[in-house]
Amino acid sequence: VPRWRQQWSGPGTTKRFPETVLARCVKYTEIHPEMRHVDCQSVWDAFKGAFISKHPCNITEEDYQPLMKLGTQTVPCNKILLWSRIKDLAHQFTQVQRDMFTLEDTLLGYLADDLTWCGEFNTSKINYQSCPDWRKDCSNNPVSVFWKTVSRRFAEAACDVVHVMLNGSRSKIFDKNSTFGSVEVHNLQPEKVQTLEAWVIHGGREDSRDLCQDPTIKELESIISKRNIQFSCKNIYRPDKFLQCVKNPEDSSCTSEI
């Protein structure tokens, strides 16, 4: 007789989740010499231990502490790029500007990027059928708590000028309910961070509006200023051109005024 299984509103665990995490860990530690000491089997065991046999609506940051400890990594604190609702461009950028890092350029972020996972209370099974949705089911689910934990730690580590890429095509360019707006903004350390520099990425080809004057950007400025951190904003009018010029700065079209 098949056991009754809780039906959640969100998609289930990504297929081949354990193999994917392990393979990503091995690949990352091969590419990044400073993380060669990491034992990927121990990393997987710690990852698994955070959510297996636990109710998927009752996960805490403490559950992830063994994984956080194993994945401790030092990135240059003044080279951090945060992003909100524009992940692909942020990742394209750090692939070109190799000295800057998004959360997904760190081991823990790389392991979990685009993956979903959850377990079941009192069984060692991974639930491949469904996992809790943040809105419809519960916020303290394995995926949400993981990203909240690593995002908080990433923001806490930042110093000097911190950059954030924001999507200028969205109705809320800055969204207080995003991970950036609800977690990272509030965990930047004013004693270490001098400035938050927002890059507003334009979507329209001929869009020359100053999106730094958007009301939601003003709201972000207000939140940041109240935390005694300086705020500044840049329009990236043509992200394709910007990326091209970061990649090939000596290109003649990147050294002449338009």
């Epitope: 001098q194 520099e197 100053d210 705020f231 500044s232 009018y237 051109k241 010029c245 990147c254």
Partner: antibody, heavy 120, light 110 residues
């Protein structure tokens, strides 16, 4: 053109307002920056008034200076001068330009500067 | 901040010689680097912007180059009129003003 005025000898603690008067420049279209230079020293940015009315200060200048503007002037108030504020104060137009998919700026028009001496 | 480090602090050049001044930013400024010339008793004058674009009326013996965090001003065929102090400045973000100018390089022409 850009012209600074108001520089003079003041005693420490006496507030002083410097005025940058522009002609042929629309302050609703251009930002104006204040830069100072102590005798024999380099250039140091104090702050900037953007065309939209936003004001940015260097961290070291916060609380020590106040920038404001009218239709043809941008004022710099030194709130409580100390001897370290002895310098030539320059006002400069900031011109934004586009390149590489984004924009940047340059200080393309400077006044002659006005000398402030703080001494007891 | 975008700390701008300029080297050397002072350099001597013979008439007709070449002078090279370097400017390093603590973070990438994406080619938005300006160079200014200042003579004693005068305000600074814009020489080069966007790393390599000559400002109006500036002689072609002045050349700017570089990208990312590393920039160079080269004066070829130095003339006595080039004796001055030269400053670099980041033009990437005017909302970040601390140390946006380099410390300056004095060029002495012999």
């Amino acid at each position: 053109s850009v012209e600074e005025s108001g520089g003079r000898l003041v005693t420490p603690g006496t507030p002083l307002t410097l005025t940058c008067t522009v002609s042929g420049i629309d302050l609703n279209s251009y930002a104006m920056g204040w830069v100072r230079q102590a005798p024999g020293k380099g250039l140091k940015y104090i702050g900037i008034m953007t065309s939209g009315g936003n004001i940015y200060y260097a961290n070291w200048a916060k609380g020590r200076f106040t920038i404001s503007k009218t239709s043809t002037t941008v004022d710099l108030r030194i709130t409580s001068p100390t001897t370290e504020d002895t310098a030539t104060y320059f006002c400069a137009r900031e011109r934004e330009f586009y390149g590489g998919g984004t924009s940047g700026s340059r200080l393309d028009l400077w006044g002659q500067g006005t000398l402030v001496t703080v001494s007891s | 901040a975008y700390d701008m480090t300029q080297t050397p602090a002072s350099v001597e050049a013979a008439v007709g010689g070449t002078v090279t001044i370097k400017c390093q930013a603590s973070q990438s400024i994406y080619n938005f680097l300006n160079w200014y010339q200042q003579k004693p008793g005068q305000p600074p004058k814009l020489l080069i912007y966007y790393a390599s674009t000559l400002a109006f009326g500036v002689p072609s013996r002045f050349k700017g180059s570089g990208s990312g965090t590393e920039y160079t001003l080269t004066i070829s065929g130095v003339e006595s009129a080039d004796a001055a102090t030269y400053y670099c400045q980041q033009g990437w973000n005017s909302g970040i003003l601390d140390n946006s100018f380099g410390g300056g390089t004095e060029v002495v022409v012999k």
